[in-house]
């Protein structure tokens, strides 16, 4: 029960005092008390409950006619059953006793008022009265948690604008209010209450450039909303009139959770004593609801695609057509961003991360716009963002970026339990370097930050500084399967690669050809692959990075060895000793449900089927998955990416609430 | 054969900032790493800044490092060097420099730590 | 003071052949077959003419020619060419935290 007022009594004349519903209120008894009296006794009028503990220990027992010893570890507290119809219409009469004199009464006028700040703290939808039931002013995570929930209203109701909802400190329309969280304040007092005292919604300094509070004034045509609290106003004095009176105010987010804010956000409503003009307001009561910001939360290859993006560039036409055609399998829709608006960018994986936020009543779903800006840098704002579908983004718009701050490097597990702790969500995973130097390339700070902040996928750091791109999609994905954890992770393996070739050879393949069938490009026989001393010490190095990532991969994502399949896969060194493909890197797939475009690695033909190929299908095929090898090799393989570079999906959200768990 | 015209280059004060470019014409510089090397006025060539062919990674000198950015714009087929915090001793004539970063090889050449196209240079002074 | 060390000036008459060296460490000449020699005639840019080691770029005659013993490459010009008077400068990938580094320059006179 929330805590009142103290009131003190007194003999000498009667005391009023304002008493809310659902609050213990405290009665000084003694200080007041004449100097002879050593006991009391105290009667109350019907809608008034009076406790008296004498400790310790603390015997408790309601009014009755019995008298009690007048010290001060006798605690008497107070608590109204109604709402007053009239001021001080609830009495409350202290009796003192003493040896010699007679008793000496003090009178108490209490006005039971009815004040309740409501959200939807058991976040089920609805907002629902909840004095005295629970405290409000505590978040909890977990199934039996509670708490408000708000989403940044980070969607684009309004097509002609180019700003953001949550931007404006207008409410666009209905569905522009769907955004937002509905905190109802609910207030039951008699009809002149309000002339001597006021309520102030409030919210922390620190606090208020994180929120806005639209105020509903319910019209008689329509409802229209004004602001009432955010990034310039702290407080707001609010007009309520007496009697029985519901207020309807509706609160937006403005920042995602981040280093510098935890997600939580105190909303309060004080109620202020105005009576004497000549003195300060006095506070009597307050009542606060805590929110936290919705995080945003990405989605695995495992969750089911919706819509498919591309790009449209130079001579890719067949490219498209064979995303087209997975897309269609998978019952996907698919967006395709133009030449004249992706400027020759066509690294659509990279320029952005389509996640989503959730709140009990509306799922939304937002692109995470990476630094990167080349060519696609318009694309999220333009295209992607709009109604119900939010935009964020992070890190510095002007340089300081690098290769690693590109979403490419930036991708999330199924969920996972690890050592007996749960991921219902997943974990992120991104590249880094393994030590920093002079050189070595990292993940932007402020966009690490931010996915920490989100607290619902704890991340987990990779080494991708080995690669010439440095992306975590170069080495490793997943894919969903029927049994076991519910999926199976990637990775490139030149191990198995060699290990093929070797049988091959074996077999008297030798002299089969890498790259047939590529006009221009110098073909390499297996004979001489497996040869080449200097490849074979480029691909000892990348296995030993590989390695290392798998060794993390099954600390941290809490996998066994039959939870990872190894694709055959070879690099080799560039400049500076990174690394790229040797051919098309087949684990740079686009996963869309059973469907995988996989980039055609125009491996050696034997027995006329590519056997690269056929030994990525005998190993996924198993787990009900189809393979369509697409030729990406002149569009995307040679400008150093692949088939999930070139792409990006947005996916279903998953069916557990975040709030559900305990990160 | 890619051509490389500098440009950008003058006269500017002690802890000024100068943005250089390197224009490409007769051929697409995005199949091309790219360095900035410096010749103080009658002195020897230094190494300044590189950039690989997919804009995914740089490196630069200890004389420059935190001072001086290296970018590429591949769609306007132009390579930058934004020098900030300039110093006396960065004077020097500007030449930018490339080498085709050919898929075929089987392995590295080492392309990247040779300069096969070098442009004409852009003289950079800096004096109060 | 340049990391890989070359003699400041070499000279030769028409016909001869003359050396330049360039030493440099383990952690550079000696480690990685990445050397390259540069060609520059005064008020001009410098011209490749020798890579990884001892590669050739097209255009350049055969009498230049390069060679690498531990941590020590050097550069022969057979049959001297007046056109040859040049500065002559080499360079190399390294471990060190500046990743390419070059010689001083030699002044090649031709008699």
């Known amino acids: 029960m929330a805590q009142g007022t103290l009131i003190r009594v007194t003999p000498e004349q009667p005391t009023h005092a304002v008493c809310v519903l659902g609050t213990l209120t405290q009665l000084d008894i003694c200080s007041s008390a004449p100097e002879d009296c050593t006991s009391f006794s105290i009667n109350a009028s019907p809608g008034v409950v009076v406790d008296i503990a004498h400790g310790p220990p603390a015997k408790k027992k309601s009014t009755g006619s019995s008298t009690w010893p007048l010290d001060p570890g006798v605690e008497v507290t107070l608590t109204m059953k109604v709402a007053s119809g009239s001021t001080g219409d609830q009495k409350v009469q202290i009796s003192y006793y003493g040896p010699k004199t007679p008793p000496v009464k003090a009178l108490l006028y209490l006005t039971g008022v009815e004040i309740s700040l409501c959200a939807d703290i058991t976040r089920t939808g609805k907002v629902k009265p909840t004095r005295a039931v629970k405290d409000q002013r505590t978040w909890t995570w977990g199934p039996c948690g509670q708490g408000a929930i708000l989403l940044v209203n980070c969607d684009r109701d309004n097509l002609e604008s180019s700003a953001m909802d949550c931007e404006d400190d207008e409410v666009l329309d209905s569905e522009d209010l769907q955004d937002m969280s509905l905190m109802t304040l609910s207030t039951k007092t008699p009809k002149d209450f309000f002339t001597n005292h006021t309520l102030v919604l409030h919210v922390a300094r620190s606090e208020m450039d994180k929120v806005r509070v639209f105020q509903a004034t319910r019209g008689k045509l329509s409802s229209k909303c004004s602001v009432v609290l955010g990034p310039k106003w702290p407080s707001h004095y609010l007009m309520v009139p007496g009697g029985k009176h519901n207020m309807d105010f509706y609160v937006e987010a403005l920042a995602f959770p981040d280093t510098d804010f935890p997600g939580l956000i105190t909303l309060t409503i004080s109620l202020l004593d105005t009576s004497n003009l000549e003195l300060p307001e006095a506070v009597v009561f307050q009542d606060s609801v805590v929110f936290r910001v919705a995080p945003w939360i990405m989605t695995p290859n495992t969750q089911p695609p919706q819509e498919v993006y591309a790009c449209s560039i130079f001579e890719n036409e067949d490219f498209l057509k064979s995303v087209t055609t997975l897309a269609m399998k998978a019952k996907c829709k698919l967006t395709i961003c133009p030449e004249e608006e992706n400027m020759d960018d066509q690294w659509m994986q990279d320029e952005m991360e389509i996640g989503y936020i959730q709140a009990p009543h509306k799922t939304l779903p937002v692109v995470f716009d990476s630094p990167r800006n080349r060519g696609l840098k318009e694309f999220p704002i333009k295209r992607v963002m709009g109604p119900d579908f939010g935009y964020v983004t992070r890190g510095p718009q002007t340089g300081g970026i690098s290769g690693l701050d590109s979403f490419g490097n930036l991708e999330v597990s199924p969920p996972v339990t690890v050592r007996g702790k749960e991921y219902p969500l997943g974990r992120i995973l991104f590249g880094d370097s393994c030590y920093p130097s002079n050189d070595s390339r990292q993940m932007h700070q402020a966009l690490q930050d931010f996915l920490s902040a989100q607290q619902v996928q704890a991340p987990v750091k990779l080494y991708s500084d080995w690669l010439s791109v440095g992306h975590v999609d170069e080495f490793l994905s997943f894919v969903p399967a029927p049994d076991r954890k519910g999926f199976r992770l990637l990775l490139a393996s030149p191990r198995s690669c060699y290990k093929l070739f070797q049988e091959q050879q074996n077999e008297g393949h030798g002299e089969a050809l890498l790259f047939e069938g590529i006009k221009k490009k110098k073909q390499q026989k297996i004979k001489n692959i497996l040869s080449n001393k200097t490849l074979r010490e480029h691909n000892s190095f990348v296995e030993r990075c590989i390695d290392w990532n798998r060794e993390l991969l099954k600390r941290e994502l809490g996998l066994a060895e039959s939870d990872i399949i190894d694709i055959p896969q070879l690099f080799k060194l560039k400049e500076f000793s990174k690394a790229e493909a040797f051919f098309p890197n087949m684990v740079n797939m686009l996963v869309l449900g059973k469907h995988l475009g996989i980039p055609k690695p125009f491996g050696p033909v034997i027995n006329g089927r590519c056997c690269l190929e056929e030994k990525v299908c005998s190993l996924l095929e198993p787990l009900g998955l189809q393979c369509t090898f697409i030729n990406d090799f002149f569009t995307y393989h040679i400008r150093h990416g692949e088939v999930h570079c070139g792409t990006n999906v947005r996916r279903k959200p998953f069916s557990f609430k975040w709030w559900n768990m305990v990160p | 054969q890619v051509q490389l015209v500098e440009s950008g280059g003058g006269l500017v004060k002690p802890g000024g900032s100068l943005r250089l470019s390197c224009a490409a014409s007769g051929s697409t510089l995005s199949d091309y790493f790219v360095s900035w090397i410096r010749q103080a006025p009658g002195k020897g060539l230094e190494w300044v800044s590189f950039?690989?062919?997919?804009?995914?990674?740089?490196y630069y000198a200890d004389s420059v490092r935190g001072r001086f950015t290296i970018s590429r714009d591949n769609a306007k087929n132009t390579v930058y060097l934004q020098m900030n915090s300039l110093r006396a001793e960065d004077t020097a004539v500007y030449y930018c420099?490339?080498?085709?970063?050919?898929?075929?090889?089987?392995?590295?050449?080492?392309?990247?730590?040779?300069?096969?196209?070098w442009g004409r240079g852009t003289l950079v002074t800096v004096s109060s | 003071q340049s990391a890989l060390t070359q003699p400041r000036s070499v000279s030769g008459s028409p016909g001869q052949s003359v050396t330049i060296s360039c030493t440099g460490t383990?952690?550079?000449?000696?480690?990685?077959?990445?050397v390259s020699w540069y060609q520059q005639h005064p008020g001009k840019a410098p011209k490749l003419i020798i890579y990884?080691?001892?590669e050739r770029p097209s255009g350049v005659p055969d009498r230049f020619s390069g060679s690498k013993s531990g941590n020590t490459a050097s550069l022969t010009i057979s049959g001297l060419q007046a056109e040859d008077e040049a500065d002559y400068y080499c360079?190399?990938?390294?471990?060190?935290?500046?990743?390419?580094?070059f010689g001083g320059g030699t002044k090649l006179t031709v008699l």
């Open positions: 360079s190399s990938h390294s471990r060190s935290s500046t990743p390419v580094l």
């Open positions: 950039i690989n062919s997919a804009n995914t990674f740089t």
């Open positions: 383990r952690g550079d000449v000696g480690r990685y077959n990445h």
């Open positions: 990884n080691v001892y």
């Open positions: 420099s490339s080498a085709n970063d050919d898929v075929d090889d089987i392995v590295a050449p080492g392309r990247g730590y040779y300069m096969d196209v």
